[in-house]
């Protein structure tokens, strides 16, 4: 007996499709093996359709794949546009030839089935309302109406022309006439259930003369959609439930044992486990809605369901949609930490990952809010300048073509603790979610500025030391001067990184940045930072101020801005002092710089599509022709 | 919530045939898959058939221990999936368990008792030599 396993018999009609799946014993060689699928002729040769190695015939051509999952030591097979030539025998296998480990399937599609003339089908989904038409002669215009549902016996009311109605249709079945028209009755049935479904008749007149007509409702569940997403991806159900519940509270679900829980709703109800994850986002008056989930764990794999009704939670006889997730652990999502750790004071580093095909796609980095249905503001991004509130202490690095972006936050406080997306205009899928975790500083930061209370005088020769221990000796130390637009890197040589030294003395390490002559424009935040290749590290911020020489005092009083500026963090990083630049100026910031909501961030369309320099943080705006000197002590 | 009940069980000779039943009742909109296991006394639990439907398509499954001789079937309009058990012998002696689920296709592994969110009762089968 063979040790792979599927359905024996498949059957189905004309026009529709199939989805086999076929299990394998749980073993490294059958997880990477090749899987096939073969069709069995008279000769007993099997004929390769599809394989997990790119081959397609040319009959499945656009209308059938093949899926592993081999974390689950199965392979999918989608069959659609199924016809009746389908019909046959077949094996769902593994091993690079035909005849390695297989198992029998036999395919009949048949004809779709015609009904009987004199029947009117109504078919319905769950939740949703039919119209029954029931027309009759002039002369029964005077006699009662009525739709009763078939039984093994007998044929039990619904409703009548009298007002009796069924207990079981009380506030769902209305019998009705339109205008004038005196030829056609209608009955309406609301909030369909399963047990609504069968063979009704409605009639008109009593005896011989009586008008009949046969009624056939079926009523379905909907079909779980098929999702297949990657670990750490993201997913968005779109959920469209119609007009009649546009005004009710909407949820999504996720079936247990007996019930479905509600993951999140309308009404403010979220579950823990997706906290700073998710989004509901209503779409518009039609009763349609989407559910945003990132950072997809391994046990978000399930059963979903989204529905309406005014309490938030599901009920029957409403209707609903949905969905099978399964989440593929060969993902293409790099892992990446899912929580970054820094301390008051400090600062943090965040390599966001993005689709290395989609190089210069817009970036962003927002923050999630629970609040209401959930929402995430956008704070930096390529062409989206920094919002006010972060200003000095924020900025996005995007290092074209290698999949990554860095966005930088310093100055951290405990109010900065909370969830945090990366995010891009383009594949959707890239979204990832950060929980950023502040905890108070309990020792001194690991880069220090001297002097802290900087003030530079107009004109004179300003110079500002960056103080560094020697665990960071070997790496790049950078001065970037900051705007809303990102963080420019002021270009330097570090002639200490040059000289061989055999000890370091924690108490001499410095990176110094010279301003000379000081201009108007050199006022600002700068930072001093430390990197490793193209992996961004701790930072530091300093906030210096240019002002005129007042008469009688060489220096003016300094500012408090740098209350904030002190920092410490654990990841390596840059080493620079500055010489001068001129930078090019980052286009116009896009529609994001005015809606900075992303409260459709699963709205692809809702995102910022401008294409741009994306290639760039870089924004300052520095005219003065200053010298800056890397001195080493 | 999804009652099931299995009937159709009883003694019988080798080389007979039964039928079992599993009417469902409740909310049997949601279901998507039927299972039938079966459980000899001293052993564990093991798979014998199950259906699952997906729209039109109909796809059944069963086990290498029955293949040939046990037919799994369903009547849509009555809510009730059928075992048909023909070539009886000894060794089918156990009690049959039917279980119903809400998950389609793929969905989990039809032959894992986990797979099954609802369960009936059970129906004995004795095959006599």
């Known amino acids: 007996k063979s040790p792979i396993f599927g359905p024996q018999e498949v059957s189905s009609i004309e026009g529709d499709s199939v989805s086999i799946t076929c299990y394998y014993p749980d073993t490294s060689v059958n997880r990477h093996t090749r899987k096939y699928w073969c069709r069995q002729g008279a000769s007993g040769m099997c004929t390769t359709l599809i394989s997990s190695n790119g081959y397609l015939s040319k009959e499945y051509s656009g209308r059938a794949n093949l899926i592993n999952f081999p974390e689950n030591n199965t392979f999918v097979i989608n069959i659609e546009q199924l016809t009746q030539d389908d019909t046959g025998s077949y094996k769902c296998g593994l091993g690079t030839s035909n005849r390695g480990l297989s198992f029998d399937v036999s395919l009949e599609v048949s004809q779709v089935p015609e009904l009987p003339s004199d029947t009117h089908v109504y078919t319905k989904d769950i939740g949703r309302n039919v119209t029954i038409e029931c027309p009759f002669k002039r002369e029964n215009a005077p006699s009662k109406k009525s739709l009763c549902k078939k039984t093994n016996q007998s044929c039990e009311l619904v409703i009548d022309s009298t007002e009796k109605v069924n207990p079981s249709y009380i506030g769902r079945a209305k019998l009705f006439m339109k205008g004038t028209d005196l030829t056609v009755f209608y009955v309406n049935i609301s909030h369909l259930t399963h047990n609504d479904a069968g063979l009704y008749i409605c009639q008109a007149g009593e005896g011989p003369s009586a008008d009949k007509k046969n009624v056939d409702l079926q009523v379905l569940a909907p079909e779980p959609e098929l999702l297949y997403k990657d670990l750490r991806s993201s997913v968005t159900f779109e959920c469209d439930l119609g007009r009649e519940v546009a005004n009710e509270a909407k949820y999504l679900c996720r079936m247990n044992k007996e019930t479905c829980d509600v993951i999140i709703n309308t009404l403010g109800k979220r579950d823990p486990d997706f906290e700073g994850r998710i989004l509901i986002t209503p779409k518009d008056d039609n009763g349609r809605f989407s559910v945003l989930i990132t950072g997809l764990r391994k046990e978000d794999a399930g059963h979903y369901q989204c529905g309406a009704h005014s309490s938030g939670l599901p009920q029957e006889g409403w209707p609903i949609q949905t969905w099978q997730l399964f989440v593929n652990e060969e993902s293409t999502i790099p892992n990446r930490r899912s929580v970054v750790k820094g301390v008051t004071g400090g600062s943090v580093a965040i390599a966001c990952p993005y689709n290395p095909k989609e190089s210069s796609s817009l970036k962003y980095w927002c923050r999630w809010e629970g609040d209401g249905n959930g929402h995430c503001p956008v704070l930096v991004g390529t062409q989206a300048q920094v919002q006010e509130e972060y200003e000095g202490r924020l900025a996005l690095f995007d290092q074209p073509g290698n999949g990554t972006y860095t966005v930088i936050l310093n100055q951290l406080t405990t109010e900065d603790a909370g969830f945090y997306w990366c995010l891009t205009n383009g594949d959707s899928r890239w979204r990832t979610t950060i929980e950023l975790q502040v905890a108070e500083a309990t020792r001194e930061p690991n880069l220090e500025v001297t002097p802290q209370n900087a003030t530079a005088v107009l004109g004179e020769t300003f110079t500002v030391s960056c103080h560094y221990p020697c665990k960071f000796y070997s790496q790049e130390k950078y001065w970037c001067k900051w705007s809303n637009k990102g963080c420019h890197i002021l270009p330097s040589h570090d002639e200490g990184a040059r000289q061989s030294s055999v000890s370091c003395d924690q108490s001499s390490q410095l990176v110094s940045m010279t301003l000379n002559p000081v201009s108007k424009e050199d006022e600002g935040w700068y930072w001093c930072g430390v990197k490793q290749g193209q992996t961004y590290g701790e930072t530091t911020a300093i906030y210096i101020a240019v002002e005129e020489r007042t008469r009688g005092s060489s220096h003016v009083n300094p500012t408090d801005a740098n209350a904030r500026a002190k920092v410490a963090l654990e990841e390596e990083v840059v080493d620079s002092s500055i010489s001068e630049k001129e930078n090019k100026a980052i286009p116009n910031p896009g529609p994001f710089a005015n809606e900075r909501e992303i409260q459709n961030v699963g709205d692809q369309a809702q995102e910022n599509r401008a294409s741009g320099d994306a290639g760039s943080a870089d924004g300052q705006s520095r005219s003065s022709s200053s010298k800056h000197h890397h001195h080493h002590h | 919530q999804v009652q099931l009940v299995e009937s159709g069980g009883g003694l019988v000779q080798t080389g007979g045939s039964l039928r079992l039943s599993c009417a469902a009742s409740?909310?049997?909109?949601?279901?998507?898959?039927v299972g039938w296991f079966r459980q000899a006394p001293g052993k564990e639990r093991e798979f014998v058939a199950a259906?699952?439907?997906?729209?039109?398509?109909?796809?059944?499954y069963a086990a290498d221990s029955v293949k040939g001789r046990f037919t799994i079937s369903r009547d849509n309009a009555e809510n009730t999936v059928y075992l048909q058990m023909n070539s009886l012998k000894p060794e089918d002696t156990a009690v049959y368990y039917c279980?119903?689920?809400?998950?389609?296709?793929?969905?989990?592994?039809?032959?894992?008792?986990?797979?099954?969110?609802?369960w009936g009762q059970g129906t004995l089968v004795t095959v006599s030599s």
């Open positions: 279980a119903a689920d809400p998950l389609g296709l793929p969905g989990p592994d039809v032959r894992v008792e986990g797979g099954y969110r609802h």
């Open positions: 409740g909310r049997t909109f949601s279901v998507y898959r």
């Open positions: 259906v699952i439907w997906s729209g039109a398509s109909t796809y059944k």
